[in-house]
């Protein structure tokens, strides 16, 4: 019995797990460099926006070294060659977003540092359905490197529902890495840091499409899974790392046979996190229902290290550690459809619980 | 509802130029500044094909059959993506469509562009 992310104590541990995921838990205190900051100030305020990462760019100089592109402050012009807007966003100078788009000083922003004591169980969070996931080979998807992640635009008809009468339509997916010496998942469990991670975009079918919904409670939905290192390999993420070298410049698009994206995620859609923050990337707009499954994905050794070093991004440099320094959570709850806070501790003095209207 | 909008297309004579513009309208949020942005065209008879693509970090990429006569630009200020089209040939006759792809793909109605004598 795989255990869950909530159940470890020490490092992640790979467990048999025959559907080619994992359950993990990480209990003990993470390695340093990925360890919050700070301690939470006792009133329980998040501590401010400026995380560990940002602070160790800008006090070592680590951007050029660390980033598939150099900052912004570096290439002269921040904005565009003619225009005068900054259009231009890299993940080396990530403080400059706001300049970009100013809905990524927000409040709710994401990615976010789960901390598992503090999730609340909550028991009306039902397993996800997903329809019409298993695409066949034809019609073909686009598969492109846009210079900041390898993206598959998905076809209409993959339908998500995240509760009675809360549908979505998948639009894309995408894929978040480090190196093949640093983990490069977005979101983090208790301050660790996974090697990777994928996001798949979904549109609320309350609207006909994207721009309507962007900034709007519940306009899109993201389905996150970590992806983890394993002996086997993974043959449905086999479909896509194949391509990555037809892809490796940057503006690259090339077909793909259709594929399962289902099996991209976990099969156990039943456990998960769920809070509300942004898109990840500029315009970092709000709204954004965030499901973050805690069941891992596994793929070997190889298949994560092909995806760490086969795409290049602006002037030449690798695209690597393409995530984003956790937000804080300014408030906000993070819920669990099952009991993480209660398994995160030996002796929980209390289990936060969810309430909503009713109850 | 975001609408792209070709431009400039028309005849032209073979050697000769001709500046494409796709220009995004009716969103709240500029879609250039955070979309790549491509030129794509087909032929009578033809698949529709890449010709160029601007990604949002300023990168740009070409078909070979282009390279070195077609330069893609933006202007993001004016939420305007730009195809300027040098020593035209024959086989250039197309319908150009932009597309931008940010999340979702959005395509433009197209404009055409006929190289001839």
């Known amino acids: 019995q795989p255990q869950g992310l909530s159940g470890m104590q020490g490092e992640p541990s790979l467990g048999d797990s025959s559907s080619g995921e994992d359950e993990l838990g990480v209990d003990v205190l993470p390695s340093e460099e990925d360890a919050p900051e700070e301690a939470d100030p006792p009133d329980g305020e998040d501590p401010p926006e400026v995380n560990s990462e940002d602070r160790m760019e800008e006090s070592l100089g680590l951007e050029d070294l660390s980033t598939p592109e150099a900052p912004e402050h570096s290439q002269g012009s921040h904005g565009d060659e003619k225009g005068g807007g900054h259009s231009h966003w890299s993940y080396g100078g990530t403080l400059l977003w706001p300049q970009v788009s100013p809905a990524c000083a927000g409040r709710f922003q994401s990615p976010v540092d789960i901390r598992l004591e503090r999730t609340a169980f909550c028991r009306t969070l039902q397993p996800l359905e997903l329809l019409g996931y298993e695409l066949q080979p034809l019609p073909e998807l686009s598969l492109s490197n846009n210079g900041h992640t390898v993206q598959l635009t998905l076809p209409p008809g993959l339908k998500m529902a995240l509760g009675p009468g809360q549908e979505y339509r998948a639009l894309q997916l995408h894929l978040h890495w480090g190196t093949s010496d640093h983990p490069g998942s977005e979101h983090t469990v208790n301050g660790h840091r996974f090697p990777a991670e994928i996001h798949v975009v979904h549109l609320s079918t309350a609207f006909s499409e994207l721009h309507e919904a962007l900034g709007r409670p519940g306009g899109l939905a993201v389905l996150a899974a970590f992806l983890q290192e394993s002996p086997e390999e993974n043959s449905a993420y086999e479909q896509l790392l194949s391509h990555l070298e037809e892809i490796s410049e940057e503006g690259s698009k090339i077909e793909i046979p259709g594929l399962d994206v289902s099996a991209l995620l976990p099969s156990d859609l039943s456990r998960y996190y769920r809070y509300e923050g942004s898109l990840t990337t500029p315009p970092c707009s709000q709204g954004v229902i965030w499901t973050v499954f805690n069941e891992t994905v596994k793929l070997s050794a190889k298949q994560l290290h092909t995806l760490s070093v086969s795409l290049w991004g602006p002037r030449d440099s690798r695209l690597q550690l393409n995530f984003r320094a956790t937000q804080p959570l300014n408030g906000r709850t993070i819920e669990a459809s099952f009991p993480a806070a209660e398994d995160s501790s030996p002796e929980p003095v209390h289990v936060n619980s969810c309430f909503t209207a009713g109850d | 509802e975001v609408q792209l909008l070709e431009s400039g297309g028309g005849l032209v004579q073979p050697g000769g130029s001709r500046r494409l513009s796709c220009a995004a309208s009716?969103?709240?949020?500029?879609?250039?500044?955070?979309?790549?942005v491509a030129w794509y065209r087909q032929a009578p008879g033809k698949q529709r094909e890449l010709v160029a693509v601007i990604t949002t970090t300023g990168g740009t990429k070409y078909s070979d059959s282009v390279k070195g006569r077609f330069t893609i630009s933006r202007d993001s200020s004016k939420n305007t993506v730009y195809l300027q089209m040098n020593s035209l040939r024959a086989e250039d006759t197309a319908v150009y469509y932009c597309n931008a792809d940010y999340l979702q793909d959005y395509w433009g109605q197209g404009t055409q562009v006929t190289v001839s004598s």
């Open positions: 009716g969103n709240s949020v500029n879609i250039f500044s955070f979309a790549a």
